[in-house]
């Protein structure tokens, strides 16, 4: 019996087609993805093959103005239109709190939404009961297939699930649910979830009875043969894991942003054993036409977005200096504003010992593309912010050793004075440079804001300590020459859309007045400094 699994993950509000790098579509003839194009391909496969499942492994929420405006209603509407068969909850589904998941998505979705390792407690338990499930048994042709869901247990640090949801260890939570499916005589089981490729592989290895793992969160691109676009494969598609009980378990993921449709064909014997699997992600490029009815629907929903982008979010009573003359040479108040917004967006008081789990932010000055003038009645709009942050990136959470941060700050000024983008703006960090020293040895003081403290204060950076830092995904991926971050990071979790983070902060503050306040100091002459 042959099953075709079509899968997406980490779509992040890319409802419209995008450019090849998943940013805003400029030249339509070269654009990719989007739900209208996805629908064309899905329907083509549904017509050609008898047993097809369309699955999503989480993180539909967050990523473009679509989510900012529609807050998840767009996800439910268009996933219903595409007739998804099941979805797993990702960490970003909790970005607007549990209410922001229940009302727009859980109550509106016509497909099951799954997670076996999220347990509700207290008053929420009855409110959310039945709206998401640990597993669902789906009829496919003459057979049944069990789908069991899972979600990153790091979600409380990455999003806003509140205090009434407990995120259990994935493997511990999945095993009893899979065992239950076995007792129900379901002998074909797919684990669908959002914990990253390493956890996907562990689930394949450790959870007895799982036949296939369809994952997300790590934006992993797998491919067999010559890849069709710029993404470099992390391994073959499917990636085959030998389980501890000796079975071959295919593991798949389909990169992100709706650029590809994962396509996996699985052959089961009469006992439900996987005896072969093959496939590849399908690049959704312009050779696949956009479905006209879905496209018309997209255009209808689009109108509200254009109106939104000119509305006032809040006011500034100071000039927001985002000029390259400032942000690539010294501390600029636009950099401070953005970093403060990044930290504010990551406030998660999950432990009495810590005022917050993260206190530090770094931001490449070259990523700040425009100032905002306060002499326009102080008004700040989404449109203004889109000029400051035009690249459609995310502000991510990484874990780094102090020694890596020190290297990053040396890189920040290794060719100072040439108006290059790598000059770092900061939050929760005080750095002093001596620019008369040779490149690679210019950081003379680097103090960081404590997290395990009731009164935050600055302490010298410790080389061997592991720190959490919020930064643009561009830097996490080694952009602007920050190869040391990419090579040495210990953990990387994708965060919220950059503009969304700043707009939310401005809306929350109502009136802003960021200052230049001595976070970054530089001098050009020899002074006697103690090294730290």
């Amino acid at each position: 019996w042959e099953l075709t699994i079509l899968h997406t993950n980490d779509v992040h509000s890319r409802l419209e087609q995008t450019s090849e790098d998943s940013s805003k579509c400029v030249n339509a003839s070269r654009c990719m993805g989007g739900v209208a194009r996805l629908f064309t391909k899905v329907q083509q496969i549904r017509r050609a093959e008898p047993n097809v499942l369309l699955l999503d492994a989480g993180d539909q929420y967050q990523g473009t103005i679509w989510f900012t405006v529609y807050k998840g209603a767009e996800v439910a509407h268009f996933m219903n239109a595409l007739r998804y068969d099941a979805m797993a909850l990702g960490n970003h589904e909790f970005d607007n709190g549990v209410e922001g998941l229940i009302e727009p998505l859980l109550k509106e979705a016509k497909f099951p939404i799954l997670s076996a390792n999220i347990k509700a407690k207290g008053p929420l338990a009855s409110q959310i009961s039945g709206l998401y499930l640990p597993y669902k048994v789906l009829p496919v042709g003459d057979e049944v297939v069990g789908i069991v869901g899972y979600t990153s247990k790091e979600t409380p640090f990455l999003s806003n699930p509140g205090t009434n949801l407990v995120f259990e260890d994935e493997i511990t939570a999945l095993q009893p649910e899979v065992d239950k499916l076995k007792t129900l005589n379901v002998n074909k089981i797919i684990a669908l979830g959002h914990s990253g490729f390493e956890m996907d592989k562990l689930i394949a290895q450790k959870v007895r009875g799982v036949d296939v793992v369809v994952g997300g969160h790590s934006n992993t691109f797998l491919y067999t043969g010559n890849p069709p676009s710029k993404e470099v494969p992390a391994g073959k598609y499917p990636f085959i894991v030998t389980s501890d009980d000796g079975r071959k378990v295919p593991v798949v993921q389909a990169y992100a942003f709706g650029k590809y449709l994962g396509y996996l064909k699985i052959e089961f014997d009469e006992r439900g054993n996987v005896i072969s699997s093959h496939g590849n992600p399908i690049l959704l490029n312009s050779s696949i036409p956009e479905d006209p009815s879905i496209k018309a629907d997209i255009n209808k929903w689009r109108i509200k977005l254009d109106n939104y982008s000119t509305q006032e979010l809040g006011k500034t009573i100071v000039y927001l200096d985002g000029s390259s003359q400032s942000c690539r040479f010294r501390e600029c108040n636009m950099g401070n504003l953005i970093c403060d917004a990044m930290i504010n967006n990551n406030l998660r008081h999950t432990d009495e010992m810590f005022w917050n789990h993260v206190s530090m932010c770094i931001l490449n000055g070259g990523g700040i593309r425009s100032p905002i003038d306060e002499r326009n009645n102080g008004t700040i709009t989404w449109e203004n912010l889109a000029a400051v942050l035009p690249f459609g990136g995310t502000f991510d959470l990484v874990q780094l050793k102090g020694s890596t941060l020190k290297k990053a700050f040396e890189h920040s000024v290794h060719r100072y004075g040439q108006s290059t983008g790598e000059f770092l703006q900061v939050g929760g960090i005080h750095v002093v440079y001596d620019l008369s020293r040779k490149p690679g040895d210019r950081v003379v003081k680097l103090d960081v804001l404590c997290t395990k403290c009731r009164v935050p204060s600055y302490d010298p950076l410790k080389m061997d300590e592991v720190y959490k830092v919020i930064l643009p995904n561009f830097l996490a991926n080694g952009g602007d020459g920050f190869q040391m971050i990419k090579d040495e990071l210990l953990r990387h979790d994708s965060g919220d859309q950059d503009i969304n983070v700043v707009s939310t902060y401005i809306s929350k503050m109502k009136v802003i007045y960021p200052a230049v306040e001595g976070r970054i100091k530089a001098h050009h002459h020899h002074h006697h400094h103690h090294h730290h």
Partner: antibody
Framework: QVQLVQSGAEVKKPGASVKVSCKAS????????IYWVKQRPGQRLEWIGW????????KYNEKFKGRSTLTADKSASTAYMELSSLRSEDTAVYYC???????????WGQGTLVTVSS | DIQMTQSPSSLSASVGDRVTITCKAS??????VAWYQQKPGKAPKLLIY???TRHTGVPSRFSGSGSGTDHTLTISSLQPEDFATYYC?????????FGQGTKLEIK
């Protein structure tokens, strides 16, 4: 094409240790499992364990746990099996094998004869 | 551990003969059975896995069948190069186990 080349025959005294190597070529070493199999003269094959060089996931047959150690050097595309506290019943040909998606022991090394004798 | 018992232990046949080797598992192994051919002084070669899937390059005269505890390897028309020892193996669960072998000799 896929090739697994094993180290040469070894003669060891009881109580000693031996380390057999298996050099892989013709494919991406970190993408496939390496299995180790023992065959005593005129006896059936016995599975010792596996190692996945991609993340060094290792699994042993309980029967061989304790005295056998599987390791891999990604940079050298080489897997190793070490047997310690050798006894006469360890005299055998030891094979490494690679899987191929849904086939377990798909490609085999030529075998390494280990003789334990005082 | 699952025991795999082959029969016969040895077998004489002529070129062109149809030959069947059976393998009995001590418990249900579904269709998770592989077959190997081994010649003296050489490493085993995979012939069949998942009961009836031929490995790359294996001639079509080799076929497998069975399910549960009883499995069979059939060689439809013996060729001179087929005289060797054949092993079955279960890949249903760890520890993987092999049969004791069937030696196929020229009559």
């Amino acid at each position: 094409q896929v090739q697994l080349v094993q180290s040469g025959a070894e003669v060891k005294k009881p109580g000693a240790s031996v380390k057999v190597s298996c050099k892989a070529s013709g494919y991406t070493f970190t993408n496939y499992y390496i299995y180790w199999v023992k065959q005593r003269p005129g006896q059936r094959l016995e599975w010792i364990g596996w190692i996945y060089p991609g993340n060094l996931n290792i699994k042993y047959n309980e029967k061989f746990k304790g005295r056998s150690t599987l390791t891999a050097d990604k940079s050298a595309s080489t897997a190793y099996m070490e047997l310690s506290s050798l006894r006469s019943e360890d005299t055998a040909v030891y094979y490494c094998a690679r899987d191929d998606n849904y086939a377990w022991f798909a490609y085999w090394g030529q075998g390494t004869l280990v003789t334990v004798s005082s | 551990d699952i025991q795999m018992t082959q029969s016969p232990s040895s077998l004489s046949a002529s070129v062109g003969d149809r030959v069947t080797i059976t393998c009995k598992a001590s418990q249900d192994v579904s269709t998770a059975v592989a077959w190997y051919q081994q010649k003296p002084g050489k490493a085993p070669k995979l012939l069949i896995y998942w009961t009836n899937t031929r490995h790359t390059g294996v001639p079509s005269r080799f076929s497998g069948s069975g399910s549960g505890t009883d499995h069979t390897l059939t060689i439809s028309s013996l060729q001179p190069e087929d005289f060797a020892t054949y092993y079955c193996q279960q890949h249903y669960s760890t520890p993987f186990t092999f049969g004791q072998g069937t030696k196929l000799e020229i009559k």
